[in-house]
Interface confidence: medium
């Protein structure tokens, strides 16, 4: 069963100072996002007891496996269903605590009824304040039955629940007709699964026989100990004011347990701690009581003492229960109550036996849950005791359960029975997540679902480089860590797997399911260095660089030139993806503005070192285009091009820019200045023959601005002159025959 | 769903006895208080008598020593004898389905019961 | 015994009207009252119960209040199948039925 435990602090009489607390013994519980572990949660639920709403009550975490609830504003505000909830996946278990308001018309004898299946339950509600009506029972919230008020018992109203089934199971609730329902008296009836000491799916499996007050669980067959009991079967007491399976909580306080109900897992309930009684746990056990309610009788024989937590403490010589056992008698020595091993293995088993006549190795022997008997193989025989070791064949999940341990002398027998868990070492469900990578290494989640049991001890990774037939390496990390796995051939792929195991020999489970991560390429070294650039225009720059010389073949897949804007504190990238590429023209800059540049070589997704920056100022933007220009052939060598002013212009015009490039050439275009703005015409001398040209042009104030339309004209061919006279401008001009 | 249907009733001398019975189905009979209620021809309602899950009876002060209510758990009915059956005992029987939260909130159609000469 | 007194004996009104039924009780019964109608040659019909309750599948327009001796069963926007004998009982002591309230259409 989980170790978990509902204490509910009793201390009435100030509503304030009422508190539930809900403790885990469980490995990692509570911790929450951890992934081992959900959260533990403890909370008031009205589905069935419904109380008037007020301020809402304060949760405090202490620690990863503890959650107190306080809050309590009034007394009605305690009135009702409490439940928490711990431990994870199928282990996930809720503890119940109702608790009674001390002032209400009717109060239970006991609050918590566990029955075996089949049983009679008998409710019963003591009548605290009268009323002369009928009394109303309730299962679950909805009316169950009904009482006439004359119908009470030496003033207790009983209700009789013959042949209980499991889905009898539930809150009950006895009430005065028209009484308020914080007036009732709340009960838990917790039915078993199984008939009496039976338990398993079909109720086939016999209960390991429960001590002081223990249950035995219909599904597992593990007893649930009462507080202040732990063991297999319950059979060894805590030290006064501990609790948990392990005995390893504390009771808060200096009065120990005193004022605290305790409720376990289904299906014990609830009851006092050890030693104490009454509805508020406050009384201490009258003499000859002791255990969780003072339920348990200790009718020690041979001088022994009864103690109100421990029971019977037996005089020298004398041992057992009621001190009925002769120290004569052989005794089973020392052998743990529970043991663990994982599945397939092959465990030894040590049992240790006294008494007189000594045991020897024959005497003792091994019983396994389907009833098989072991001898042991051997022996160590001391001064005090016989050690018999037993060789266990190789474990399945069948062998869970109850084993027995067994000496048999002339002076009579003893028997030690013990719980075997079988746990299923862990499988991975899922392969490792890739979280970076890098070329010579990878980073790596180990952290995945599993089948099978835990906790998790040790997480190795396992990794080889794809379709290889090497041998696999292997890193043994921390479960909650991520893992680096190092000194790895760069732009390769690898094949990752990881293991996990648990505690014990042979915990190591399969590898769970491949993955494939890749390396990352190699970073580039060579730094290269920015030859030179030039203004092509207000928004365009021309770059080129060049890269140091080295043996071998180049490691990368281009460049990126990147241009820092400084004033904007943007950052300008352009990929140049041929390796070979020596010069770029970037286009679409912002004129007027200081840019920083540089250059780096690139692989795949790696950069390699930047060049040294430059700094290069764009001209700011110059006057619009020039409007209508128009081209009109003159001759066999010249064409002459008008054109209208740009309009709304920010200045002066200092010049015009003619650019002339034959139409469908290879070769760069021309650019010819007209060096007197005033002009709306220019004659473009010194052109070939029956020739097309491509004609465009731009003004300049202090920078160069937009290009006009392009036009096409042809040179005349044979000689042939046009009509007309010409007026020309004074233009540079420069001939075109190349 | 519920149902409650009485029979029984008819044409009796004065001091005659008369046992009506009420047959239930649709709920759990034996977690349920029962009444018997009456109505004389053109008159209003009047409780007869009632009986808890347990047994526990109460009758009218009307009626008392000579209507005796009972019930058989085991065949979900619920009973009426009546004897020393007087004129003014002529009327309606119904039997109801007791409190669930005070008031009968179930019904048969019921029987009439003629006590005449 | 606990005597329950119902007023008015007979009560008319029309389709869309309130109206208002009123029982006495002879001594305090907290709240222990049920409302019952009944139509002519039907079983009578549980309303109401705990004097404000009411039962489910009976409609809004039916409402009760009151505690001790003195109850109130209200019938807001009177419809056809409302026009009916309406009944008291008290459950505090045994069980009395009130002599009746007639509901006729006027």
């Known amino acids: 069963a989980v170790d978990l435990t509902l204490l509910a602090n009793l201390r009435l009489t100030d509503p304030q100072r009422f508190f539930l607390t809900c403790v885990s013994g469980e490995a990692g519980a509570g911790r929450g996002s951890d992934a081992w572990g959900p959260p533990l949660l403890l909370e008031k639920d009205d589905r069935i007891v419904r109380t008037p709403p007020g301020p809402p009550l304060r949760l405090a975490r202490n620690g990863s496996h503890q959650v107190t609830l306080r809050g309590f504003s009034k007394p009605s505000d305690l009135v009702g269903v409490f439940s928490c909830v711990g431990g994870a996946g199928a282990r996930r278990t809720r503890v119940i605590y109702v608790h009674n308001s001390p002032g209400a018309h009717l109060l239970p004898d006991k609050v918590t009824h566990t029955v075996n299946k089949g049983d009679t339950a008998v409710l019963s509600a003591r009548v605290h304040k009268e009323k002369q009506t009928d009394v109303i029972w309730k299962s679950n919230g909805s009316y169950f039955y009904t009482l006439d008020w004359h119908e009470a018992q030496d003033g207790r109203f009983l209700l009789q629940l013959p042949n209980v089934q499991p889905p009898s199971s539930g809150i009950y609730s006895a009430t005065y007709l028209e009484a308020s329902p914080l007036g009732s008296a709340f009960f838990r009836l917790i039915v078993r699964g199984c008939g009496a000491g039976r338990w398993g799916p079909g109720c086939t499996k016999e209960c390991p026989g429960c001590l002081h007050g223990g249950v035995c669980h219909d599904h597992d067959g593990e007893c649930v100990c009462p507080p202040g009991f732990t063991g297999t079967r319950c059979e060894q007491a805590c030290r006064e004011g501990r609790f948990g399976q392990s005995c390893q909580e504390q009771c808060p306080g200096i009065s120990g347990c005193r004022g605290l109900t305790f409720c376990l897992p289904d299906p014990y309930g609830c009851s006092c701690g050890s030693g104490w009684r009454g509805s508020q746990c406050q009384e201490a056990c009258a003499p000859g009581h002791f255990g969780a309610d003072c339920r348990l009788q200790c009718q020690c024989q041979n001088g022994g003492t009864c103690d109100r937590f421990s029971g019977c403490v037996c005089p020298s010589g004398w041992h057992g229960v009621h001190c009925e056992k002769s120290d004569r008698i052989p005794q089973i020595l020392n052998m743990a109550s529970e043991l663990e091993f994982n599945l397939e293995t092959m465990p030894r088993i040590n049992c240790a036996a006294a008494g007189n006549p000594f045991p020897v190795r024959g005497s003792i022997e091994l019983r396994k849950p389907d009833g098989t008997v072991l001898l042991s193989t051997k022996a160590i025989v001391e001064p005090e005791k016989t050690t018999a070791e037993f060789e266990v064949p190789r474990l399945v999940l069948a062998d869970s359960g109850f084993w027995e341990c067994r000496v048999s002398t002339s002076g009579g027998q003893d028997s030690r029975r013990f719980k075997v868990n079988v746990k299923v070492p862990p499988v991975p469900l899922a392969a490792p997540r890739l979280l970076t990578k890098q070329s010579r290494q990878l980073v790596v989640s180990p952290l995945v679902s599993f089948s099978g049991d835990g906790p998790i001890s040790t997480v190795r990774l396992h990794y080889r480089p794809q379709d290889s037939t090497m041998d696999w390496s292997t890193i043994v990390v921390d479960p909650s860590e991520n893992v680096t796995l190092m000194n790895l051939r760069p732009k390769t792929g690898y094949s990752v797997r990881v293991q996990l195991s648990r505690p014990g020999e042979g915990g190591e489970g399969a590898w769970g399911p491949p993955t494939l991560m890749t390396t990352d390429c190699p970073e580039p070294l060579l730094q290269p260095w920015l030859e030179g650039w030039h203004v092509e225009g207000t928004d365009r720059l021309r770059v080129s660089w060049s890269l140091p010389l080295v043996p071998g073949p180049l490691v990368g897949d281009g460049f990126l030139l990147r241009l820092w804007d400084g004033t904007r504190g943007q950052e300008r990238r352009e990929n140049v993806s041929s390796p070979q590429a020596r010069t770029a023209l970037l286009t679409g800059l912002t004129p007027g503005t200081h840019y920083q540049l540089d250059v780096q070589l690139y692989h795949c997704t790696l950069l390699g070192p930047a060049s040294p920056p430059a700094h290069v100022l764009l001209p700011p933007s110059g006057p619009p285009a020039p409007r209508h220009l128009h081209a009109q052939a003159l001759s066999d060598s010249e064409i002459q091009l008008t054109w209208k002013h740009p309009e709304a212009l920010p200045g002066p015009i200092s010049k015009y820019v003619v650019e002339v490039q034959v139409a469908g050439g290879a070769g760069d275009p021309l650019w010819i200045d007209v060096d007197r703005p005033e002009e709306t015409s220019t004659i473009i001398r010194g052109l070939n023959a029956s020739t097309r040209y491509l004609f465009r042009m731009r003004a300049s104030i202090q920078g160069l601005g937009d290009w006009s339309n392009t036009v096409e004209e042809s040179t005349l061919g044979n000689g042939l002159q046009a009509e007309g006279p010409v007026q020309e401008s004074r233009a540079a001009e420069e001939g075109l025959d190349q | 769903e519920v149902q409650l249907l009485e029979s029984g009733g008819g044409l009796v001398q004065p001091g005659g006895s008369l046992r009506l019975s009420c047959a239930a189905s649709?709920?759990?009979?034996?977690?349920?208080k029962m009444w018997w209620v009456r109505q004389a021809p053109g008159k209003g309602l009047e409780w007869v008598s009632s009986i808890s899950p347990g047994g526990w009876t109460h009758y009218a002060d009307s009626v008392k020593g000579r209507f005796t209510i009972s019930r058989d758990n085991s065949k979900n009915t619920l009973y009426l004898q009546m004897n020393s059956l007087r004129a003014e005992d002529t009327a309606v029987y119904y039997c109801?389905?007791?409190?669930?939260?005070?008031?009968?909130?179930?019904w048969g159609q019921g029987t009439l019961v003629t006590v005449s000469s | 015994d606990i005597q329950m007194t119902q007023s008015p004996s007979f009560l008319s009104a029309s389709v869309g009207d309130s109206v208002a039924i009123t029982c006495r009780a002879s001594?305090?019964?907290?709240?222990?009252l049920a409302w019952y109608q009944q139509r002519p040659g039907k079983a009578p019909k549980l309303l109401i119960f705990?004097?404000?309750t009411l039962q489910s599948g009976v409609p809004s327009r039916f409402s009760g209040s009151g505690s001790g001796t003195e109850f109130t069963l209200t019938i807001n926007a009177l419809q056809p199948e409302d026009f009916a004998t309406y009944y008291c009982?008290?459950?505090?002591?045994?069980?009395?039925f009130g002599q009746g309230t007639k509901l006729e259409i006027k």
């Open positions: 649709g709920f759990t009979f034996s977690y349920y």
């Open positions: 001594q305090d019964i907290s709240r222990f």
């Open positions: 705990s004097a404000s």
């Open positions: 109801a389905r007791g409190p669930v939260s005070s008031g009968g909130d179930y």
């Open positions: 009982q008290q459950l505090s002591r045994y069980s009395t």
